[in-house]
Amino acid sequence: AGVFELQIHSFGPGPGPGAPRSPCSARLPCRLFFRVCLKPGLSEEAAESPCALGAALSARGPVYTEQPGAPAPDLPLPDGLLQVPFRDAWPGTFSFIIETWREELGDQIGGPAWSLLARVAGRRRLAAGGPWARDIQRAGAWELRFSYRARCEPPAVGTACTRLCRPRSAPSRCGPGLRPCAPLEDECEAPLVCRAGCSPEHGFCEQPGECRCLEGWTGPLCTVPVSTSSCLSPRGPSSATTGCLVPGPGPCDGNPCANGGSCSETPRSFECTCPRGFYGLRCEVSGVTCADGPCFNGGLCVGGADPDSAYICHCPPGFQGSNCEKRVDRCSLQPCRNGGLCLDLGHALRCRCRAGFAGPRCEHDLDDCAGRACANGGTCVEGGGAHRCSCALGFGGRDCRERADPCAARPCAHGGRCYAHFSGLVCACAPGYMGARCEF
């Protein structure tokens, strides 16, 4: 057991031209906060895949208002660390997503708003108990500087927090900076020292004196970038002599998925589909209860009060899987009829219909309406053997002969305000949206 700690040092415009001045303004004061998502292994960084190592939300930073004419400073940040506790072994390799959010404090239609400013992701190797690692990531015109470390919670020690170590009551015979470790009376826990000259950026070690390379680097000291241009196979470990990837086993060979999980290859790695009760990159995390928050993407957990009873995740629309970890590709069900193009907008499905067809799923053939009369510019739509009229703005009823409130159908998206006008309707869009119907 232990804690992953993230310290944000600064967030602000990156170097170079075209950098934004500030996410806040005199008209729109705001404050920043951060979300971090951790995943074991060098896994996919898709934001919707599960944060199987854990996630955290920071407190909100102080209110900031840009001063006109003043140089853009680094923005005021929340106090304190973001801490993500982990119960099991620290995996050594992990992926992260850090999101910078802005809480807008001006007068918002519909109350306070959150908007995402930047999302950075990366893959790292990190031994628990080591020093703080510093990092700089850029997302568009923004730059985020931060440090992170993983530390074990006593009595756990070691690079994976899997050994138990406790001070002995007898006086210690270990030298300065070393501590006695149970169960061996004469064993001392020492800081890990890698091979001399091992690249601090691209190398790491799990045993004293070794130098193992991060993905993309090779050589005895991990100082040589891997070049795959002259390589025959994209699989396998890198060769120290050529810098090339040499053929190796497929990612699913030997089934890396534990606890009955099934393995499928992905373009860059593999993916385990885990049975209920297990999750993690290799289905290695078990004994999960609802208190561990195993349901991702807003899924709600039922049952699972203790490790021996199963939990069930009820997934919100658009997600599936035993932990709501998979985004549903709703267009794969081909819901658009008559050759319509399917668009999955995340919050809804849209069908873009071919000429001559209409309806939410392009189910109406407009060609069958010949001779039907719709008044006031209405359009006839075939549906289930009976025609109906799709009326122009301002008209309603079976044949579009009745006056109607053009705002009654709430045509303005994303919280926009609708105003009836002699020529139709006008949408006043909420901040951050635009278009005739606030659709962008």
């Epitope: 708003a113 208190a291 928050g293 807003g298 919100p316």
Partner: nanobody, 129 residues
């Protein structure tokens, strides 16, 4: 099945107080927001208060600031809404909801219904003058 169960509604004179409770059965909500919404006859559903249990972030609608207080009891999986100085215009059906920013969202309104995927059945509050 997920259940959010509201209680504590009733009738009260203007200036009086009520305390609503929302019990969430069968799951922990520490990574979610829990919110209170209300809907008066003929009006849209409006968000009035919401809380994130992980960092105790709270939001209130302007119409209830200083009068209503949202709080939580993580051990009981329950969220409360303490309503003081009630006014006749507070008369509505009050709903409890759970949710948060959807994955990959780049904008979210904590006091608006989108993103709240789970809702209770509601409890009626009537304030007479």
């Amino acid at each position: 099945q997920v259940h959010l169960m509201e209680s504590g509604g009733g009738s009260v004179q203007a200036g009086g107080s009520l305390r609503l409770s929302c019990a969430a059965s069968g799951y922990t909500y520490r990574s979610n927001f829990m919110g209170w919404f209300r809907q008066a006859p003929g009006k849209e559903r409006e968000g009035i208060a919401t809380i994130h249990s992980g960092v105790a972030t709270t939001y209130y609608a302007d119409s209830v600031k200083g009068r209503f207080t949202i709080s939580q009891d993580n051990a009981k999986n329950t969220v409360y809404l303490q309503m003081n100085s009630l006014k006749p215009e507070d008369t509505a059906m009050y709903y409890c909801a759970a949710g948060g920013p959807p994955a990959n969202a780049d904008r979210w309104y904590p006091l608006r219904p989108p993103g709240y995927n789970y809702w209770g059945q509601g409890t009626q509050v009537t304030v007479s003058s």
